[in-house]
Amino acid sequence: EPPTACREKQYLINSQCCSLCQPGQKLVSDCTEFTETECLPCGESEFLDTWNRETRCHQHKYCDPNLGLRVQQKGTSETDTICTCEEGLHCTSESCESCVPHRSCLPGFGVKQIATGVSDTICEPCPVGFFSNVSSAFEKCRPWTSCETKDLVVQQAGTNKTDVVCGPQDRQR
């Protein structure tokens, strides 16, 4: 009686159970009554990560430098390559298939959260009493200089982009 189901790591073909190929190998020919399943190792830059009956191995993921990607972990015959963003770049999507430079916060805005490999810079407007006069992916809004603590007075009010200008107090004779 021919089998209707096979054991783990086997597959049914021509009414008989053949061994699957192990991870890292592809199927060349099915087994017969007289011969075992024939498997061959995947080539360079190819992989198969499961017991299988695939006749072609999968290509390793391509970490395209023109998309800002680099190899984080080199693939093997049993594992895929893992890509990550180059320094100073972050992913454009959850699956991280391309990367772009971190955004800078413009003058008048400061960095609320510094970018990571998976998230962009988060900027916030500088509130009253704070300023930023640079375009930066790292700098937070800075507080206006306190003229009083220097025994000076405000000569020019600060804005979200400029610091206050302090000057000497007018001395009344």
């Epitope: 391509y62 395209d64 998309l67 454009t92 999507s93 298939e97 391309s98």
Partner: antibody, heavy 117, light 107 residues
Framework: EVQLVQSGAEVKKPGASVKVSCKAS????????IEWVRQAPGQGLEWMGN????????KYNEKFKGRVTLTADKSTSTAYMELSRLRSEDTAVYYC??????????WGQGTTVTVSS | DIQMTQSPSSLSASVGDRVTISCRAS??????LNWYQQKPGKVPKLLIY???RLRSGVPSRFSGSGSGTDYTLTISSLQPEDVATYYC?????????FGQGTKLEIK
Amino acid sequence: EVQLVQSGAEVKKPGASVKVSCKASGYTFTTFPIEWVRQAPGQGLEWMGNFHPYNDDTKYNEKFKGRVTLTADKSTSTAYMELSRLRSEDTAVYYCARRGKLPFDSWGQGTTVTVSS
Amino acid sequence: DIQMTQSPSSLSASVGDRVTISCRASQDISNYLNWYQQKPGKVPKLLIYFTSRLRSGVPSRFSGSGSGTDYTLTISSLQPEDVATYYCQQDRKLPWTFGQGTKLEIK
């Protein structure tokens, strides 16, 4: 399925401008850059520039700088290539292509631009 | 710009023949070399990327090799449906540049 659908054929006079559109579907438009390539009749392929819809980053081939403008409308997942000050040598098929998981992995069907007086 | 020179510019071969197309870059492109197939009246299609990686769905009779400045596309056994123009393209340095193409015909 990733698809790039381009606008129809155009006939223009020398000195005019042309704007070719490329509507993307089947993937998240802002994930990958769009490349623009042209092919003059019976000739090879020539890269014009690329545009990343995520951050509007644009790179141009020096040969076309000042004449070509690449833009996109994220709300409609459409990329645009505008070429100004047209001359007869600009008669060509203009292609958009996605630089996706692989280089130039999906192409539009091409837009024929004829420049003739 | 990096110049890409293909040879031959055209060739005629018989079904079943082994066909090779060469591509030379004017400077080292570190394997950043792609091959495209353009059938008459059709859109170019990526065949091979990063010198030797076969795009999924492309018949295994196509292969690529090379390094430095010299690269080769090989068709191990030519089929009638392989009639097309083949282009190499360097992906190493902007502006991306293509070879002038090799037109392949069946004898």
